[in-house]
């Protein structure tokens, strides 16, 4: 083994380097000293380091490490932050469009129900938005409130428009009757099923992305232990004490040090992998009644069908409710009020056509593919950091923490380290409390993601009732069937498309009208999207 080169007789190089770290030279010896007070850079001979310099090196080493860790995670962090924001905004746009669709349906088909219907629809979709963002709201309660609020208006405006003002204090009775008499048939239950399933999945998807950001932020801002600081100092700075300014640490040595320093962080790896794979499973299942875009943008149709159901049974209902809510029936229900053949002016939305069409669904899949390229992020961190900090290639003529060596030997380096502190002990301490906490959060979100994900081979839930309505019972090659009253079944094409200008706003006046399409599929609508021409019959 070659003898170490003689240290700089005046410590001049060390002084000039150290001055960059710490202005002022009071801590740097003029000439090499025995260094008996040193605790990290144990000298084999005279040294150009003092105890104070060693402390400064340790602080700098830990700061360097934190910066390396932050730069290592920058791309991943940006990917998740950007997508969390994009999806949150996209989901809000879907909700806004769904609200406008529903308002347009009332405006075009039931003008006498507005503006009360607008108010109830607005409240419902506000709750939908809040639920997606994590509010503690019960979806069934939201749907019940919508129908409870709508029925008194439908009854007094559509079914019994001649009711005297004195009879209009029966709202509470009508709200109760709505549930007791199942006046909307099974439509509220159908909507509950579809809305709750799709919103739960949407909400957990957003929560998972936000937790991903929290995981990266947690590991980004980890404070490394003093033991780690000493190891890093030995690796990066102790060579300077011997005047070896241009020597780089051995690559193998760097890996050993990084594994020791990052033992706690690497424990996240298993749960991070599970997180990405569980998120992928969830995304794969986000279609049909598990796709909020599909469900919400077709909601206007189901609500429309539910009102038609009430109108078809209006005769029976009016008599029963007349008795139940004890008001004199002023006017017989008029079938002319049933807008079966109501024709609404054709409305065609013209929006600038963009060649590149990106659906929410494809955007989700794209995110998963990108995330999967980071599946080994935590296990690869020690290697990544070593490859992005100065190390000697091929482990030749490099610093092993004690001396300049021609070839790096892991065994010799480990033995050398044992004089300082036990690397095994460093690993056995277990993760920092913040790492334990983030691991538990990851475990929990993974449980939620797996709970939400549809097991392979499981058929979509069938909620069959007396009227024979089924939830999620369309063939695999079809889009989700929304509604299901038998007549006027509407298939909704999942077509909300992504643009840079995500915030495109749709006013009620611009909502899809009742356009007759000269195609065999005149029952099929393309839901509003911010691309292309849209023909949407509302009937």
């Amino acid at each position: 083994q070659p003898p170490p080169p003689p240290p700089d007789a005046t410590c001049h190089q060390v002084r000039s380097f150290f001055q960059r770290l710490q202005p002022g030279l009071k801590w740097v010896p003029e000439t090499p000293v025995p260094g008996s007070d040193l605790q990290v850079c144990l000298p084999k001979g005279p040294t150009c380091c003092s105890r104070k310099m060693e402390e400064k090196y340790q602080l700098t080493a830990r700061l360097n490490m934190e910066q390396l860790l932050q730069s290592a995670s920058m791309e991943l962090k940006f990917l998740i932050i950007q997508n969390a924001a994009v999806f949150q905004e996209a989901f809000e746009i879907v909700v806004r469009h769904a609200k406008n669709y529903t308002n347009a349906m009332f405006k075009n088909n039931y003008p006498s129900l507005t503006p009360q219907a607008f108010e109830f629809v607005g409240e419902f979709f506000t709750d939908v938005s809040l639920y997606i963002l994590g509010s503690d709201i019960n979806v069934d309660d939201m749907v019940n409130e919508l129908f409870d609020s709508l029925f008194p208006v439908i009854y007094t405006q559509l079914m019994n428009p001649g009711l005297p003002d004195s009879a209009l204090d029966i709202n509470e009775c009508l709200r109760g009757a709505r549930r007791d008499l199942k006046v909307f048939g099974n439509f509220p239950k159908l909507i509950m099923t579809q809305v709750s399933k799709s919103l739960q999945v949407t909400r957990i998807f957003l929560q998972a992305l936000n937790l991903g950001i929290e995981v990266i932020n947690t590991t980004d801002h980890l404070k490394f232990s003093k033991d780690c600081g000493r190891m890093l100092t030995r690796m990066w700075y102790c060579s300077y004490c011997q005047g070896l300014m241009m020597v780089k640490p051995c690559g193998g040595y760097c890996n050993v040090v990084m594994q020791g320093c990052m033992a706690g962080v690497v424990e996240i790896d298993k749960y991070w992998r599970e997180y990405i794979l569980s998120l992928e499973e969830l995304v794969n299942g986000m279609y049909r009644i598990y796709d909020m875009e599909n469900v919400l943008l077709g909601l206007f149709s189901t609500i429309h069908d539910s009102i038609q159901y009430v109108q078809k049974n209006a005769g029976k209902l009016t008599t029963t409710i007349g008795k139940l809510c004890a008001h004199s029936q002023q006017r017989q229900y008029r079938s002319a009020y049933y807008p079966e053949d109501l024709f609404i002016d054709k409305k065609v939305l013209k929006v600038a056509h963009v060649e590149h069409e990106e659906t929410l669904s494809s955007r989700r899949r794209e995110l998963i593919q990108k995330l999967k390229s980071f599946i080994s992020f935590y296990s690869a961190l020690p290697g990544y950091i070593c490859s992005h900090s100065p190390v000697a290639e091929n482990d030749t003529l490099c610093w092993n923490g004690q001396e300049l060596v021609e070839r790096y030997s892991q065994k010799a380096a480990r033995n050398g380290m044992k004089n300082q502190f036990n690397l095994h002990e460093l690993k056995m301490k277990g993760p920092e409390p913040v790492v334990s906490q983030i691991i538990d959060k990851l475990k929990h979100i993974n449980q939620l993601l797996r709970t939400m994900s549809m097991p392979k081979g499981r058929v979509l839930d069938k909620n069959l009732d007396e009227e024979g309505f089924e939830s999620g019972d369309c063939g695999d090659d079809e889009d989700e069937c929304i509604g299901g009253s038998g007549d006027g079944m509407i298939k909704v094409k999942n077509q909300l498309r992504f643009l840079a200008e995500l915030a495109y706003d749709l006013d009620v006046d611009d909502a899809p009208g009742n356009s007759q399409q000269a195609t065999p599929k005149d029952n099929e609508i393309s839901t509003f999207h911010n691309l292309g021409n849209v023909h949407s019959p509302l009937k």
Epitope: Q437, D440, K441, K443
Partner: antibody, heavy 115, light 107 residues
């Protein structure tokens, strides 16, 4: 020292309500999901409910769905279980447990539903 | 829901014996399985998490193995304080479910 202490158990008539509390100490309560688990006399363990660390997600066993509500107050480091429409079969020792891995449990509180 | 089936429901053994308890899940849960020990009048205590990881402070005579649907808890040399009831539990997805328990008694 990490500790969970359940309170609020007692004897109650069928159809009535009871609210259990679980006071947490010695750890960052707001960073952990929390569970309720019960054990009927002479029987095995039955998971009851879970609440996410921020309270945003709740799951229940089918046997208690619609009757029990799990909640938490992170500012008070306390977990709750509101039990309504109690039945004889809800008679059990109720435990709270910490985290997705349920690594720490309280000593339990006894709920007896009897007329 | 994922069903957990434990066997045997009870066993008699002597101090120093090697004891094995098995647990089967109705569908794959990978390694999302925990083992608990419960003594009369006491709360359950976590022994093993993620099928094979020993919880801090638990003696090394306890070990866990398995993945997918079949799991095993082994006590290499039974000690007097090990006489208790043991439960397996899946923590893969909700609702979380426990096995029915295995009571280890003194022969």
């Amino acid at each position: 020292e990490v500790q969970l202490v359940e309170t609020g158990g007692g004897v109650v008539q069928p159809g009535r309500s009871l609210r259990l509390s679980c006071a947490a100490s010695g750890f960052t309560f707001s960073s952990y999901a929390m569970h309720w688990v019960r054990q009927a006399p002479g029987k095995g363990l039955e998971w009851v409910a879970v609440i996410s660390y921020d309270g945003s997600n709740k799951y229940y066993a089918d046997s208690v769905k619609g009757r029990f509500t799990i909640s938490r107050d992170n500012s008070k480091n306390t977990l709750y279980l509101q039990m309504n429409s109690l039945r004889a079969e809800d008679t059990a020792v109720y435990y709270c447990a910490r985290g997705a891995g349920m690594d720490v449990w309280g000593q339990g509180t006894t709920v007896t539903v009897s007329s | 829901d994922i069903q957990m089936t434990q066997s045997p429901s009870s066993l008699s053994a002597s101090v120093g014996d090697r004891v094995t308890i098995t647990c089967r899940a109705s569908q794959s849960i990978e390694d999302d399985l925990a083992w608990y020990q419960q003594k009369p009048g006491k709360a359950p205590k976590l022994l093993i998490y993620e099928a094979s990881n020993l919880q801090s402070g638990v003696p090394s005579r306890f070990s866990g193995s398995g993945s997918g649907t079949d799991f095993t808890l082994t006590i290499s040399s039974l000690q007097p304080e090990d006489f208790a009831t043991y439960y397996c539990q899946q923590h893969d997805s909700y609702p979380l479910t426990f096995g029915q328990g295995t009571k280890v008694e003194i022969k």
